[in-house]
Amino acid sequence: VPLSRTVRCTCISISNQPVNPRSLEKLEIIPASQFCPRVEIIATMKKKGEKRCLNPESKAIKNLLKAVSKERSKRSP
């Protein structure tokens, strides 16, 4: 749902359901800014590069973020 137009926030809907980390190309956490007053979490999927918006307040999403950051810290030397 990210668009090239100038809009305040990116996400049209937000999901409470975590994505499968194996289907994930990248995970972006976009902090609140003057353009969008809320944190947005955007998951880019491997298939078609589709972008999914996740609910930062969801417990399942918070667990996903922990798992992904744990996986990243394992990979980095």
Partner: antibody, heavy 119, light 111 residues
């Protein structure tokens, strides 16, 4: 179960205004972008507008831009469509719909409300 | 602007297979997912295919979807046609998300 119930349709003269409402229940309305889609008698589906879950983003079809305004009240689980400067070609059944997007893969449609623009 | 074009009508006999095409113009059809909706007279649309080829639960496996990049088109195939399949069918994609684009619709008659 999920329900979307439209209201506010009726007969209106060209150039006049009308406000449609859509009452939602059975899903997390405040997480969901919601659309209006219309269907002229005997014609196909035409996307009209969408509003983001928090109301910050609104997008419109070129055919209604500048005349129609989409809005929502998450405290009431209700979506609105303010239609101004109505034309004969706006005559249609108007559906409120939660369509597949980048957060939800299910779609829900209301039963529709008929708007007739005629003098 | 991205547009989707469908044949106005198709007809086939019960038990046979029918394919409804949806051709994209003004952009690549495989850039975004395609959905297919069924609309029976007097009813709201319901999804029969989402994400190009996925079936919602409750939709029989007689319904299948595919994408052909070379012809820039999507197809809905219904095998083992039944009289209850008689309806209007619409393809849908994005220009881009969250701007929805619908095809003009195809009336399926089961003879």
């Amino acid at each position: 179960q999920v329900q979307l119930v439209e209201s506010g349709g009726g007969v209106v003269q060209p150039g006049r205004s009308l406000r449609l409402s859509c009452a939602a229940s059975g899903f997390t309305f405040s997480n969901s972008g919601i659309h209006w889609v219309r269907q002229a008698p005997g014609k196909g589906l035409e996307w009209v507008a969408v509003i983001s879950y928090d109301g910050s983003n609104k997008f419109y079809a070129d055919s209604v831009k500048g005349r129609f305004t989409i809005s929502r009240d998450n405290s009431k689980n209700t979506l609105y469509l303010q239609m101004n400067s109505l034309r004969a070609e706006d005559t249609a059944v108007y559906y409120c719909a939660k369509l597949r997007d980048n957060a939800e893969y299910t779609d829900y449609w209301g039963q529709g409300t008929l708007v007739t623009v005629s003098s | 602007n991205f547009m989707l074009t469908q044949p106005h009508s198709v007809s086939e006999s019960p038990g046979k297979t029918v394919t409804i095409s949806c051709t994209g113009s003004g952009g690549s059809i495989d850039r975004n997912y395609v959905q297919w909706y069924q609309q029976r007279p007097g009813s709201s649309p319901t999804t029969v295919i989402y994400e190009d080829n996925q079936r919602p639960s409750g939709v029989p496996d007689r319904f299948s979807g595919s994408i052909d990049s070379s012809s820039n088109s999507a197809s809905l195939t219904i095998s083992g046609l039944k009289t209850e399949d008689e309806a209007d069918y619409y393809c849908q994609s994005y220009d881009p998300l969250p701007v929805w684009v619908f095809g003009g619709g195809t009336k399926l008659t089961v003879l």
